[in-house]
């Protein structure tokens, strides 16, 4: 049967993003409509047809355009994605003979981790804090020279859609740690990044 091929995309916040749909059919469509999926009913964003060209709905005027003007292959581009743009989008190919054939492409917005790593001595112990803020939520791990060191983790969700994960390493005998390297590992979207800290006695 006739189908539409799509691909989900993950793009960084405040960068451009494109979603593409391809109608797997011998014939082009008569009109292509892009809609944003919403809880109640989909919202029309933009249409393209030979008769009327590109027609962008007012709410999307400065946000998107159709960058591949095709009736078999259609691409919309968001100029500068925000968190509100995250979601799923439907492309509807209104074809002669087979009606509306739709595909769904989902856009996920990510924010690269911002990481801070610092330490603080107390009289009898050392706290090393590693904090990572990202979207989706990052994970924080420790690589330390010896085992048995305790850590505590706090997760905080922010209104802007990012999540902070703060992990504190509690070292009871700080003298043994002086001059040694501690590594905070941040896992985000399948990539692990090492942040190294050498403890110096202030």
């Amino acid at each position: 049967q006739v189908q539409v091929v799509t691909q989900d995309e993950r793009e960084q916040l405040y960068t451009p993003a494109s979603l593409k749909c391809s109608l797997q059919n011998a014939q082009e469509a008569l009109i292509v409509t892009w809609q944003k999926k919403k809880a109640v009913s989909p919202e029309n964003m933009v249409t393209f047809s030979e008769n009327h060209g590109v027609v962008i709905q007012p709410a999307y005027k400065d946000k998107i355009n159709i960058t591949q003007l095709g009736l078999q292959n259609s691409t919309i581009t968001f100029w500068n994605i925000t968190l509100e743009d995250e979601g799923c989008y439907m492309c509807l190919f209104n074809t002669f003979g087979f009606g509306k054939i739709s595909g769904t492409a989902c856009l996920t917005v990510y924010v690269q981790p911002i990481v801070s790593l610092h330490y603080k001595f107390s009289e009898d112990h050392l706290n090393i804090t590693c904090s990572a803020t990202a979207r989706p939520a990052p994970m924080v791990f420790w690589k330390v020279p010896r085992s048995g060191i305790e850590n505590s983790t706090v997760t905080l969700s922010h209104p802007n859609g990012t999540t902070s994960v703060t992990s504190i390493l509690h070292i009871k005998d700080p003298k043994n740690q002086v001059g040694k390297e501690v590594i905070c590992q941040v896992l985000h979207l399948g990539t692990v990044t090492d942040f190294k800290q050498t403890v110096n006695k202030g």
């Epitope: 049967q1 059919n25 011998a26 014939q27 008569l30 074809t95 002669f96 003979g97």
Partner: antibody, heavy 117, light 107 residues
């Protein structure tokens, strides 16, 4: 040159089936939809259904309640329209045509199907 | 199903006349309408598609207009070969449906 050549006239008894062929030549068969319309004596044209030869996807007028089947043989560049459980009101001229999207340009010469006891 | 109603059902005119045939859809069909000409014992011939686009090879005296529910086919100056029956076809919604036809006869 482009041609759609249909099979010859048929006389059928009520309850029987008829299969009309439409042989295409002069173009790439899978690039155009093949459609079938019919016209009973003194009546308007009636869309029966169509097929996209590329995938073999077809769409039928539900008025025919599953009595119509449209198929194709890409190796023979031929489309077929089969109508079953024939009744007298199916007496008509059956035409095949081709379209690129909504652009209809060539038609077969028509096949007269007579249903009579 | 969408009903297509043509008017008039028949029409007498002379060579050189300007003739208008109308087609009304029972609901909005956008611009998804074609016009066909048919002569006795012959297959239909496509004249106009998408309401106002002329099919290649069709004389420019034929024109189409309209959108939504009301459409017209105009022949600006009738020629002897134009006497035939004309049908409109909607293809906005399946099943696609034809009008009942307008028979154009010589006066």
């Amino acid at each position: 040159q482009v041609q759609l050549v249909q099979s010859g006239a048929e006389v059928k008894k009520p309850g029987a089936s008829v299969k009309v062929s439409c042989k295409a030549s002069g173009y790439s068969f899978t690039d155009y939809i093949i459609l079938w319309v019919r016209q009973a004596p003194g009546q308007r044209l009636e869309w029966m259904g169509h097929i996209d030869p590329y995938y073999g996807s077809s769409n039928y007028n539900l008025k025919f309640k599953g009595r119509v089947t449209i198929t194709r043989d890409t190796s023979a560049s031929t489309a077929y329209m089969e109508l079953s459980s024939l009744r007298s009101e199916d007496t008509a001229v059956y035409y095949c045509g081709r379209s690129k999207r909504d652009y209809f340009d060539y038609w077969g010469q028509g096949t007269l199907v007579t249903v009579s006891s | 199903d969408i009903q297509m109603t043509q008017s008039p059902s028949s029409l007498s005119a002379s060579v050189g006349d300007r003739v208008t045939i109308t087609c009304k859809a029972s609901q909005d069909i956008n611009s998804y309408l074609s016009w066909f000409q048919q002569k006795p014992g012959k297959a239909p011939k496509s004249l106009i598609y998408r309401a106002n686009r002329l099919v290649d090879g069709v004389p420019s005296r034929f024109s189409g207009s309209g959108s939504g529910t009301d459409f017209t086919l105009t022949i600006s100056s009738l020629q002897p070969e134009d006497f035939a029956t004309y049908y409109c076809l909607q293809y906005d919604e399946f099943p696609y449906t034809f009008g009942q036809g307008t028979k154009l006869e010589i006066k």
